[in-house]
């Protein structure tokens, strides 16, 4: 550590004295000081000198010698007083910038130790300070303001008992700025625009802060726009507002919009687009096929997105059949708005009925004019078969009906035993029918084939199976002979329709 | 070794106000004064104003109503503001250390700052 | 207009002796010490003597410095050519409560 010759902690001084401060270190050292008139510095080997012949109550402070080579940091330090019967304080600073809730120092220095009973700090003009205001003295630095708020940026002065009477520094302004937490906050409404040509537009950027140091500006396509600003204080925030209003929109008014607002932390942006279009428009979608196939029993919801302006005057969802008269109940409805030009509209449809099947269509209307998007719902059902045995042409035949969506595929088995189910250990012979016949095939029906097995003799320790199959599932029907003529019946008494 | 570096926008419009930053790395701001000091092209130096640690401020008389020197936002920074600028505020903008009022031994490489629209 | 008055050129050739003055007024060189300052093309000021007549480690001996009354000068001793730079003197003013400079003088190494 250093070591300062006169060794003692503070030296006072008659002005037009000359002062000689030595430093010493084991390298190089220098020294420091608040701003001050008429120093001189010189080195001296190892040591370094601060001398004056002519001391004023300005080189009243404290003085610091240091070694930079030292990886410790140490320092000395020793407190000049020159005491000035006409100038009782020494003040370092026109000006002190602190943040709310630091400790504020006003850097009046004492010139005279033998005043500090008698002093105290003031508000310029004589005015005593606020309220709350909580301030500590120390001679060498001046009085601290603890726990500094902003309310408390005012113009202060030290004052001094000298001979009875008060003598005053010059003034110091305390600034106390508000922590600012980060960039100000930014809206820019709306958050998306569209108008006919010739309509009226209007677009507000507005930011906010604790602090009122801030700026803020909107520009259209990277163009700063000239707009008055309006300011505002309320709930302890700071608001400028740039209001953009234009009376009658054109194809160039449109384009990206942008709010901008900039302070010591950063800044914060925040865009818009502004659309202007010739006329009224209503634009209908999906993002689900317009044709859709759901197993019976479960539930589907069909999304409609819808692009308009001006807004919607009307909409609704219609079954358009071919079923039943019935219309989808509102509350299976929902409509949700994305934006301001953007909604989705729902229709859920919980555990479809077979009646359900059909079309289903969204209407919709503005000013634009009417647009309906259509839905074709068919169910898929699994396969349902019935197996009977007849005669064609003379010729035995066991005949498989079998019913479902998709149009299902058959097969016939034939395995020895009775049984309801031929299982592969029992399977005798497997015969694949390609192509059965279509019976029925209308739109959101079931298709319904027919598959005949041509059998010459019924052999009557076996079991005849036909097997259907689609995506859905599978269905059987097991046919045991009993006698020859078991289960005779013409072909069109087990036909049906669904 | 102590450095200083300057940093901000090297372009300003005429009325804005013109911020800079200064970070001081191998040493501490908190003991020394640090200064802001600027030269026009093709002129001299001209004195800004005087930054200490704790807050306290002196200003250059023909700058004082329009600057403020304080604390940066993050530790061992300071930061010049001077509003309203115009085209005479071009300028290299520096900081330095400062020993004793007119010794700086320690100076930032400097920020080119123009005003124009 | 700079405080303090300096010529704004000085030139010399290599090995020359040049002086570069510096004048003042009795609230600044008067009352204060001076410091000279080299600002070599494109780079920031560089401290090159404090009060009046001190050299910082690192600032050859060529270089001194020297106060009367309220005027100082900058001596350069066998000149070479990195010498080539701007020279700038400062001093503290009592009435500005503040630092001057001069308006700084180009040398030119012939």
């Known amino acids: 550590i250093p070591v300062i010759e006169p060794s003692v902690p503070e030296l006072v001084v008659k002005p037009g004295a000359t002062v000689t401060l030595r430093c010493v270190g084991n390298g190089s050292v220098e020294w420091d000081g608040p701003p001050s008139p008429h120093w001189t510095l010189y080195s001296d080997g190892s040591s370094s000198i601060l001398s004056t012949n002519n001391a004023t109550f300005q080189n009243t402070g404290t003085y610091r010698c240091t070694e930079p080579g030292d990886p410790l940091g140490g320092s000395a330090a020793i407190h000049l007083y020159v005491k000035d019967p006409a100038r009782p304080w020494n003040v370092l600073a026109q000006e002190v910038v602190v943040f709310e809730d630091q400790d504020a120092l006003l850097p009046c220095l004492l010139t005279d130790p033998v005043l500090e009973a008698g002093v105290s700090l003031v508000r310029v003009r004589g005015r005593p300070l606020m309220r709350h205001t909580n301030y500590s003295f120390s001679p060498w630095h001046g009085f601290t303001i603890h726990r500094a708020k902003f309310i408390q940026s005012q113009d202060y002065q030290c004052s001094a008992l000298m001979g009875g009477r008060k003598v005053m520094s010059i003034s110091i302004r305390l600034k106390v700025q508000k922590v600012i937490p980060g960039p100000p906050a930014l809206t820019l409404v709306p958050a998306e625009l569209v108008r006919i040509r010739g309509e009226a537009a209007q677009i507000v950027c507005s930011a906010s802060s604790v602090d009122v140091n801030f700026d803020v500006f909107l520009q259209h396509n990277n163009t700063k726009l000239a707009i008055p600003q309006q300011s505002d204080f309320h709930n302890n925030r700071y608001q400028k507002v740039l209001t953009l209003n234009l009376d009658q929109v054109d194809f160039q008014h449109a384009g990206n919009y942008s709010c901008v607002a900039s302070n010591v932390q950063g800044k914060h942006s925040t865009s818009m687009f502004f659309r202007v279009v010739e006329s009224a428009y209503l634009n209908l979608s999906s993002e689900q096929n317009l044709i859709q196939e759901v197993t019976v029993g479960e539930g589907l919801n069909l999304k409609v997105m819808v692009e308009a302006y001006p807004g919607l005057q009307g909409f609704n969802w219609t079954y358009l059949g071919p079923f039943s008269d019935h219309q989808p109940e509102p509350k299976l409805a929902n409509a949700t708005t994305k934006d301001t030009y953007r909604h989705t509209f729902t229709l859920s449809l919980p555990r479809l009925k077979p009646s359900e099947a059909g079309r289903y269509s969204f209407l919709a209307r503005n000013p634009g004019g009417w647009r309906a998007l259509t839905f074709e719902l068919t169910l898929r059902y699994p396969p349902e078969v019935s197996v009977i045995w007849t005669f064609i042409n003379g010729s035995g035949t066991l005949l498989c009906a079998a019913s479902g969506y998709p149009q299902p595929n058959v097969t016939w088995l034939q395995c020895s035993g009775h049984t309801d189910r031929c299982d592969e250990a029992q399977v005798l012979q497997v015969w694949d029918d390609p192509y059965p016949e279509v019976l029925s095939q209308e739109p959101f029906h079931k298709v319904t084939v027919q598959s005949l097995l041509t059998v010459e003799t019924l052999e009557h320790n076996q079991t005849y199976e036909c097997r259907a199959h689609n995506s859905v599932g599978s269905g059987s029907w097991a046919f045991i002979p009993i006698s020859a003529g078991a289960h005779t019946h013409p072909p069109d008494e087990f036909l049906f329709t669904p | 070794q102590v450095q200083l570096q300057e940093s901000g926008p090297g372009l300003v419009k005429p009325s804005e106000t013109l911020s800079l930053t200064c970070t001081v790395s191998?040493?501490?701001?908190?003991?020394?004064?640090w200064i802001w000091i600027r030269q026009p092209p093709g002129k001299g130096l001209e004195w800004i104003g005087y930054?200490?640690?704790?807050?306290?401020?002196n200003y250059n008389p023909s700058l004082k109503s329009r600057v403020t020197i304080s604390v940066g936002t993050s530790k061992n920074q300071f930061s010049l503001k001077l509003s309203s600028v115009t085209a005479a505020d071009t300028a290299v903008y520096y900081c330095a250390r400062s020993r004793l009022g007119s010794i700086f031994d320690y100076w930032g490489q400097g920020t080119l700052v123009t005003v124009s629209s | 207009q700079s405080v303090l008055t300096q010529p704004p050129s000085a030139s010399g050739t290599p090995g020359q002796r040049v002086t570069i003055s510096c004048s003042g007024s009795s609230s600044n060189i008067g009352s204060n010490t001076v410091n000279w300052y080299q600002q070599l093309p494109g780079t920031a000021p560089k401290l090159l003597i404090y009060s009046n007549n001190q050299r910082p480690s690192g600032v050859p001996d060529r270089f001194s410095g020297s106060k009367s009354g309220t005027s100082a000068s900058l001596a350069i001793s066998g000149l070479q050519s990195e010498d080539e730079a701007d020279y700038y003197c400062a001093a503290w003013d009592d009435s500005l409560n503040g630092p001057v400079f001069g308006g700084g003088t180009k040398l030119t190494v012939l």
């Open positions: 191998g040493g501490s701001i908190s003991s020394y004064y």
């Open positions: 930054f200490y640690y704790s807050g306290s401020t």
